[in-house]
């Protein structure tokens, strides 16, 4: 029969890779024990009289040691054994996504630790303390709401980690309007236009996360291709939640995204989800000189070459450098494409 | 022929400190986990606390923790208990003694005792 | 924590005589128990652990039994160098280790 002691298992932590050994509380070293693990006995050979050596810990050593006085299987000691590492420095990141409301930060190790963490924010407006309310939802991540708009001092947010094995820290600093950065247009909707076989209706609406776009107006960029290729077209569009594709090209199914950002300040968002449309492919009556001489001019494009290069930021970069690129890094290899060209491509 | 020699028992105010000593030889003491008992005067016996062989694992009776400290040194076969904050109920013989290897554990050798009197 | 309660606290008894003195633990404690002697003026010297087996150099008339929560030593027949102040101790959950308050066996 094996006894129990009502005392709760020593929790313990060790570093992965390390040797460990674990005593039998507080048993003579002569004193005659068996270790198990999860129940199942180890090897004698592990053994240095009465404590338990391991070498090289690894993830599969964690688990619960017992070791018992081999006569009368009486338990001794339990070790609850945790194999992780100490928190490397923490990846922080703040946006705005609601503003002028607030911005939040969330953050994340760049490599487990696979025991518990501790994280410790605090924000600072100048020599302000805010307070970062954490995210209900989202244990990594909290909010701060704006108390000074367009204020030219800087917020900065520092965050630690600990956990049983080290600590950790970073800190950024930034001014209100870089971190703004709307959430991607929602309800993005490509329909084919009757008896219109080059163009696309796009619509969408402004996220609904943004609080208030008639006193902070959005802008819209707009990217679409044709399934089988590669290249993006754009067009960037100051105000709407609308756009007219023309220069479609006949039954090929299209891919549509759309991004948004302030007029003002901050960086795009993410691309929105994409929307899925192939032009009307009927074969067309026949169009009047004065028609055709429209549909020229209206179009955005004449060919798969991007737009004018204008300094725009592409969302689909974004990093946490947030960096602006030109049309020609957005588009991959340019090159022009003709119609003939489109029709010998084939559907992967 | 195993021996305990505890020193270091004094007569000290309430607040003061006191570092008493025992000293073993005749058995293999870095092999052992080492307790000190007390016993106020005409009363009963009371466990204070233990170190085990190697020094890593020391546990303490509710009425010293924080307040008085065991370690050991098994190059010079002794054993030390520091007790600071020291009241007038730390009053006592103070023992050192050795468990036994086998189980249950028991007290297998102890020392003669060395008195604490903790009074103003 | 165990509490330890024996009993009596004292009795008197007259050589020959032959003595029972109870331990009881506030929980079972299997046979992890060790009963003492202690003279005065002397540390206590071990006579019987795990409830029942005599330490070597203890007289034969000295004897442990029980099991769980409720111990027994048994003195056959009083020899006038037994009396002294008897302790259980148990050693089932430790730390801490517990002793129970004493039995004084005086002279009648």
């Known amino acids: 029969q094996r006894h129990s002691p009502q005392e709760a298992p020593h929790v313990q932590y060790e570093r992965l890779g390390s040797d460990v050994t674990l005593p039998c509380g507080t048993a003579n070293w002569d004193a005659a024990v068996t270790w198990r693990v999860n129940g199942t006995d180890l090897a004698p050979d592990l053994l240095n009289g009465s404590q338990l050596v391991l070498h090289g810990l690894e993830l599969g050593h964690s688990g619960l040691y017992a070791c018992f006085h081999r006569d009368s299987w009486h338990l001794r000691h339990q070790v609850l054994l945790h194999v992780g590492l100490p928190p490397r420095e923490p990846v922080l990141s703040c946006r705005s996504n609601t503003y002028p409301k607030g911005f939040y930060c969330s953050w994340h190790l760049p490599t487990p630790t696979y025991i518990p963490n501790t994280f410790n924010v605090t924000v600072l407006h100048g020599s302000k303390i805010m307070v970062c309310e954490k995210d209900p939802a989202l244990k990594n991540r909290c909010h701060i709401r704006y108390m000074h708009l367009f204020s030219t001092i800087k917020y900065k947010v520092s965050i630690s980690v600990s956990n049983a094995l080290g600590h950790n820290a970073t800190a950024i600093t930034f001014d209100e309007f870089t971190i703004v950065k709307p959430d991607p247009p929602e309800n993005v909707v490509a329909r084919p236009v009757p008896s219109n076989p080059r163009r696309l209706e796009v619509t969408w609406q402004t996220p609904s996360t943004w609080p208030d776009p008639e006193s902070f107006p959005l802008k819209f960029f707009l990217r679409y291709r044709p399934l089988i290729l590669d290249q993006w077209q754009h067009v960037e569009l100051s105000d709407g939640t609308a756009h007219t594709i023309t220069d479609a090209y006949a039954g090929k199914e299209y891919i549509i995204q759309v991004a948004a950002k302030d007029n003002e300040i901050g960086t795009w968002s993410d691309w929105s989800v994409a929307a899925h449309a192939t032009p009307w492919t009927e074969e067309p009556r026949h169009l009047t000189t004065e028609a055709q001489a429209a549909e020229t001019t209206t179009s955005t494009t004449s060919s798969l070459a991007p737009p004018p290069t204008t300094k725009i930021c592409d969302p689909g970069e974004l990093g946490s450098e947030q960096k602006l690129i030109s049309e020609e890094d957005l588009g991959g290899e340019q090159k022009l494409i003709s119609e003939e060209d489109l029709h010998h491509h084939h559907h992967h | 022929q195993v021996q305990l020699v505890e020193s270091g028992g004094d007569v000290v105010q309430p607040g003061r400190s006191l570092r008493l000593s025992c000293a073993a030889s005749?058995?293999?003491?870095?092999?052992?986990?080492m307790h000190w008992v007390r016993q106020p005067p005409g009363k009963g016996l009371e466990w204070v606390t233990i170190?085990?062989?190697?020094?890593?694992?020391?546990y303490y009776a509710d009425s010293v923790k924080g307040r008085f400290t065991i370690s050991r040194d098994n190059s010079k076969n002794t054993v030390f208990l520091q007790m600071n904050s020291l009241r007038t109920e730390d009053t006592g013989f103070y023992y050192c003694?050795?468990?036994?290897?086998?189980?249950?554990?028991?007290?297998?050798?102890w020392g003669q005792g060395t008195l604490v009197t903790v009074s103003s | 924590d165990i509490q330890m309660t024996q009993s009596p606290s004292s009795l008197s008894a007259s050589v020959g005589d032959r003595v029972t003195i109870t331990c009881r633990a506030s929980q079972s404690i299997s046979s992890y128990l060790n009963w003492y002697q202690q003279k005065p003026g002397k540390a206590p010297k071990l006579l019987i652990y795990?409830?029942?087996s005599l330490q070597s150099g203890v007289p034969s008339r000295f004897s442990g039994s029980g099991s769980g929560t409720d111990f027994t030593l048994t003195i056959s027949s009083l020899q006038p160098e037994d009396f002294a102040t008897y302790y259980c101790?148990?050693?089932?959950?430790?730390?801490?280790?517990?002793f129970g308050q004493g039995t004084r066996l005086e002279i009648k």
């Open positions: 101790q148990q050693s089932y959950s430790t730390p801490p280790i517990t």
């Open positions: 170190i085990s062989f190697d020094g890593s694992q020391k």
């Open positions: 005749g058995f293999t003491f870095s092999y052992y986990g």
């Open positions: 003694a050795a468990q036994s290897s086998t189980w249950p554990e028991y007290f297998q050798y």
């Open positions: 795990a409830a029942s």
